[in-house]
């Protein structure tokens, strides 16, 4: 039985198909030029060395050419996401050539066998591109390979094998099993195109990570940390089908990468922005909302070409459905404590009031713990554009009914039994918008009353554009 193929070795004998099903007539890899948005319309099949179909089907040699490469399939048929992507590409780039790479006979295998077919499919695409390059006006620079799951690594092989350099490869949640940690020639990598951008939506540190966790492109974007996608929880999928199962969750999260890309094509007026960060936890803390030195980028089709010397990991939050865009805010809150309060874990909520709209009540996620007499940084995000922020309501949630919060209350009391009044002082909140990069300072509405305790709230009004106050030295602890 075949084993995974390295960059060397014969290609023609590599098709890994169990003997019992090797009775195929049509070629294993077909190139379907989609001439219409209608999924029922068959389009044209391109054939290596045959120029007539190119002319008959109106292949535009000077236009952009997209190759959509599907992944492993259990069903053996094209899934709905593919038709949506074809339609979105036609909508956005009216003159472009949209080619669907149909390798269903080789993908409709055991996953591991399909993996072992990726190299030969990549080689077929490279040969097609080499042949197209022989035509006048066709340029590899205009070629954009879009691969989903296993298809992302097929795109990598194609980019590796082609004579010259493909303009762009987009990897939509590249497959993880058998590729995680693999040599760069055996998976998608930055060397495979002039620009390789990747969306990771199903990465897991437990169980089996269906999407690859490691960065494999010039930019690697991890929406919602690259793991739990909003709207894909068991509860969400349970609501939409007779039986919500882990497989539905997997499909929802893995496929989310495609829908984020489609969103970037059809909702270009609502682009989602991602921010460079070393890891998901730092991003959750709100530390990484900078656009300086190419530290932020649009995601999906609108991503600006960045060819860093090393991989750039980027993060963002999204909504549960299209349009996926949210508005990110970094909030810096300097917390003073006049009493030694021991370890304290307040549950803070904020409501943002803007010129266009007011936000819902948003939790301040405490990634580690609240530092007293220090600046604490938080990430909050809203689904609607609030416009210019005017004021902020900060609430410290009172004793909750949850056992966890009751335990927190009890533990806090046990550590400080003679401290009945838990109280923190917050004079101002600094806010930075990720999308506009605008910095604002909000001061306590009543400068004489800056204390907050469980069940209480504080109001802050915008008191300055920018962060530095008059006569102010830097705060004790300033996070980057």
């Amino acid at each position: 039985s075949p084993t995974p193929f390295g960059p060397e070795g014969q290609l023609e004998d590599e098709l890994h198909k169990p003997k019992a099903i090797q009775t195929e007539v049509k070629p294993s890899v077909r190139f379907n030029l989609r001439t219409s948005k209608d999924p029922e319309h068959e389009g044209c099949y391109l054939s290596l060395g045959h120029s007539q179909p190119l002319e008959d089907c109106g292949f535009n040699m000077t236009a952009k050419t997209f190759f959509i490469i599907h992944g492993w399939t259990m069903s053996g048929i094209f899934e709905n996401w593919l038709h949506k992507l074809v339609s979105a590409l036609h909508t956005r780039e009216k003159d472009a050539n949209v080619v669907v790479v149909d390798w269903l006979p080789l993908a409709h295998q055991l996953y591991t066998d399909a993996v072992n077919n990726t190299r030969v499919v990549g080689h077929s695409i490279a040969r097609m591109l080499d042949w197209l390059q022989e035509k006048d006006d066709f340029s590899l620079e205009n070629v954009h390979l879009i691969g989903y799951s296993l298809g992302a690594h097929v795109a990598g092989y194609a980019g590796n094998f082609v004579k010259g350099t493909v303009g762009r490869i987009t990897g939509l949640d590249p497959a993880g099993p058998m590729f995680e940690g693999a040599d760069i020639h055996k998976r998608l990598s930055p060397d495979d195109a002039d620009f390789v951008d990747v969306l990771h939506t199903y990465t897991r540190s437990f169980g089996l990570s269906i999407g690859i966790q490691m960065p494999v492109g010039h930019i690697d974007i991890y929406p919602n940390g690259g793991d739990f996608q909003p709207g894909c929880g068991l509860n969400d999928v349970l609501g939409s089908m007779a039986y919500g199962t882990i497989t539905e969750v997997v499909k929802c999260e893995h496929e989310r990468a495609v829908h984020l890309f489609v969103d970037s094509l059809v909702n270009q007026d609502k682009p989602s922005f991602a921010f460079q960060c070393t890891d998901s936890n730092r991003f959750k803390k709100g530390i990484c909302l900078s656009c300086r030195k190419n530290r932020c980028n649009s995601i999906g089709y609108n991503a600006k070409k960045m060819r860093n010397k090393r991989n750039s990991k980027m993060y963002l939050k999204t909504r549960a459905g299209m349009p996926f865009r949210v508005y990110h805010y970094q909030m810096k809150i300097h917390v003073f404590s006049y009493k030694n309060m021991g370890e304290i874990e307040p549950t803070f909520y904020v409501t943002l009031y803007g010129t266009n709209a007011d936000s819902q009540t948003l939790p301040l996620e405490i990634v580690e713990r609240i530092e007293q007499n220090a600046t604490n940084t938080f990430l909050v995000y809203t689904e609607e554009d609030l416009g210019d922020l005017l004021k902020i309501q900060l609430t410290w949630e009172g004793a909750s009914q949850s056992w966890y919060n009751l335990w927190k209350e009890l533990r806090s009391y046990l550590s400080q039994p003679h401290n009945p009044g838990r109280e923190l002082n917050i004079r101002r909140i600094r806010v930075k918008s990720g999308e506009t990069q605008r910095k604002l300072t909000f001061c306590a509405e009543d400068p004489e009353n800056t204390s907050i305790s469980p069940g209480r709230e504080l109001w802050f009004r915008k008191c300055r554009d920018g962060w530095r106050m008059k006569n102010e030295t830097s705060p004790t602890v300033e996070l980057p």
Epitope: P18, T112, T245
Partner: antibody, heavy 119, light 107 residues
Framework: QVQLQQSGAELVKPGASVRLSCKAS????????IHWVKQRSGQGLEWIGW????????KYNEKFKDKATLTADKSSRTVYMELSRLTSEDSAVYFC????????????WGQGTLVTVSA | DIQMTQTTSSLSASLGDRVTISCRAS??????LNWYQQQPDGTVKLLIY???RLHSGVPSRFSGSGSGTDYSLTISNLEQEDIATYFC?????????FGGGTNLEIK
């Protein structure tokens, strides 16, 4: 919860055929592959083949392709395996099990059906 | 076909013992190795998938390790209910193949 309920024990004559059933419940039937596995008395397990109800896709172990025929009835959420031209070598317990995608494991098993081939 | 070999067909151990069962593949199976438990009544359960991932509901005393061609299943603290036959299976390529099984008994 996921359950695979198999049909009862069968006593059949050499040369005859038998049809075993595996009724699935607790999940979306068309989204998972059902595998069949053979276990002869006191011996190991042998993979026979799979049936994927989503597209009626079937794969067989070469060794069983002239012995087993897999079919399904979506309306009753049941996968069938017909064993033909039975000999004493076919006397065994036959299990159906559900495939977990990507991991290539069998996460849920039926209770097994004992087939005895005897004159 | 890939051959799966469990060299120990029978193993005796005492309750509370740490038990290791090994399995060897005739070629590299890229971690596509699963472990199953068959109880005395014939019931089969998945314990470990993809070499080391614990299937839901399986006690944490079970663990798996290995790579390439050599894999093992460890039970850290043997309990009465663990008395069963254990099979390894490769899911790397068709046809899927199983080891001959290791029957675990109480000393």
């Amino acid at each position: 919860q996921v359950q695979l309920q198999q049909s009862g024990a069968e006593l059949v004559k050499p040369g005859a055929s038998v049809r075993l059933s595996c009724k699935a419940s607790g999940y979306t039937f068309t989204k998972y592959t059902i595998h069949w596995v053979k276990q002869r008395s006191g011996q190991g397990l042998e993979w026979i083949g799979w049936f994927y109800p989503g597209s009626d896709s079937i794969k067989y172990n070469e060794k069983f392709k002239d012995k087993a025929t897999l079919t399904a009835d979506k309306s009753s959420r049941t996968v069938y395996m017909e064993l033909s031209r039975l000999t004493s070598e076919d006397s065994a317990v036959y299990f159906c099990a559900r495939h977990e995608e990507y991991t290539n494991s069998l996460a849920y098993w039926g209770q097994g059906t004992l087939v005895t081939v005897s004159a | 076909d890939i051959q799966m070999t469990q060299t120990t067909s029978s193993l005796s151990a005492s309750l509370g013992d740490r038990v290791t069962i090994s399995c060897r593949a005739s070629q590299d199976i890229s971690n596509y190795l699963n472990w199953y438990q068959q109880q005395p009544d014939g019931t089969v359960k998945l314990l470990i998938y993809y070499t080391s991932r614990l299937h839901s509901g399986v006690p944490s005393r079970f663990s798996g390790s290995g790579s390439g061609t050599d894999y093992s299943l460890t039970i850290s603290n043997l309990e009465q209910e663990d008395i069963a036959t254990y099979f390894c299976q490769q899911g790397y390529t068709l046809p899927w193949t199983f080891g001959g099984g290791t029957n675990l008994e109480i000393k």
